[in-house]
């Protein structure tokens, strides 16, 4: 099943997020992703856990998953590089780099996103954008067009409360508010963008969505700058 949803969001402005990628398995949306270099898409490692026998591709330049759009193009994946420390049973190090079969054709609707290299926390209360094609309500309706939501970053101490994520949020993770508006299982791999810079990637651990006591969890890309650089080199 697709790993992803934006709950309580709204339809995104078409092609205003030219870095947005749909990671697809056998032609169907599986996870979000973000174009970080001409030939590389960053996503979540857990997205490919069940994809061993399937064909993984990356869709760029899309707003609608089904409708023809001049900017849309599906790329094969030359190489999938999960973070070496990612494991099926934890949310830690949940990053995946996908090398496209060729450099993406860049344009107004396809453009890499600058990613944060300064290893510092986003200040609590800062509003950040998360987007994806995951289901939009608890009944499981899947959107055809890209959805987004602007969420405030939550401080780690609150996120780590026993009633929330009970100490699971390491310094390499961050949280955002989840009160009825949330990213969830299948926006996994998608970008959390603050002021035009990629700060986080939606983790793909299973958790309840839209419950304010279970904030959204995101992998801090700045904490993995050395690994990203080493793979992209």
């Amino acid at each position: 099943p697709p790993r992803g949803r934006i709950l309580g969001g709204r339809e995104a402005e078409a092609h205003a997020r030219p870095y947005m990628a749909s990671v697809q398995l056998n032609g169907a949306h599986l996870c979000g992703g973000v174009l970080v270099a001409e030939q590389w898409v960053l996503s979540a490692a857990h997205c490919l856990e069940d994809a061993a026998d399937g064909k993984v591709q990356v869709l760029l330049g899309a707003h609608s998953l089904s409708q023809p759009e001049p900017s849309k193009r599906l790329y094969d994946v030359l190489r999938a590089v999960p973070h070496p420390d990612s494991q099926p049973d934890t949310i830690d190090h949940d990053l995946l780099l996908l090398q496209l079969s060729e450099k993406a054709t860049l344009g107004p609707a396809v453009r890499p996103l600058p990613w944060q290299r300064v290893d510092r926390d986003v200040a609590p209360g800062t509003l950040c954008d998360v987007a994806g094609w995951g289901i939009v309500n608890h009944a499981g309706r899947r959107p055809d067009s890209l959805q987004h939501v602007l969420l405030p970053v939550l401080d780690r101490a609150t996120c780590n409360r026993r009633t929330h994520h009970d100490g699971a949020i390491t310094e390499r993770l961050m949280c955002a508010e989840s009160n009825r508006r949330d990213s969830c299982k299948g926006d996994s791999g998608g970008p959390l963008v603050c002021g035009g810079v990629l700060e986080g990637v939606v983790t793909s651990g299973s958790r309840v969505c839209g419950n304010r006591k279970k904030p959204g969890i995101y992998t801090r890309v700045a904490s993995y700058a050395a690994w990203i650089d080493s793979v992209l080199a």
């Epitope: 309580g8 709204r10 402005e13 205003a16 997020r17 870095y19 200040a123 609590p124 209360g125 800062t126 509003l127 950040c128 954008d129 987007a131 987004h148 602007l150 405030p152 508010e177 009160n179 009825r180 508006r181 963008v193 603050c194 002021g195 035009g196 810079v197 304010r212």
Partner: antibody, heavy 122, light 107 residues
Amino acid sequence: QVQLQQSGPELVKPGASVKISCKASAYTFTDYYINWVKQRPGQGPEWIGWIFPGSNSTYSNEKFEVKATLTVDESSSTAYMLLSSLTSEDSAVYFCARLGYFGSSYHALDYWGQGTSVTVSS
Amino acid sequence: DIQMTQSPASLSVSVGETVTITCRASENIYSHLAWFQQKQGKSPRLLVYSATNLPDGVPSRFSGSGSGTQYSLKINILQSEDFGSYYCQHFWGTPWTFGGGTKLEIK
């Protein structure tokens, strides 16, 4: 044209409460954060907090957490701010403002109400 | 809380001149900054978002620049309608504080 129409001026006694309204029109009310801002004569504005009408989530400046209560009525596309235990320090013009989206992740207060003057005097 | 310090507090200039107003944050705000213009008795008007970007309808004589803790608003060839007060505001964490303002007066 997006508009935020605020309620009229208020003259209230110390210790009393006052509820200011802000009626939004020409956009989807539940899609945008509504912010409240205080401005005393000759001073810079002060951010009080925001409310997101789609979820009733609020986020307040600690300085105003006890003073101001933010609510919305989705059916009438109206935001409210209740100011309680008023003192002379609360005499000011209060603005509501919409947090607009620009591009993918940029935002700023793009549309403002005309302001509501609150005077606290015995 | 992040403090926003604007300078100068007031400025007396003539129509046609170019002016620069500065805003200093007490810590890095990573370009999460807006500028507003406010006329006496009116609501603030958004001029710049994300430090450098102009919303639709704002004349190109206005420009924003800066990064880290230092930001500027430049007004090229001042027009009579540009007189009033100018405020910066940050959006990095909360509370979203404003600067104390710069009052632009006609010489």
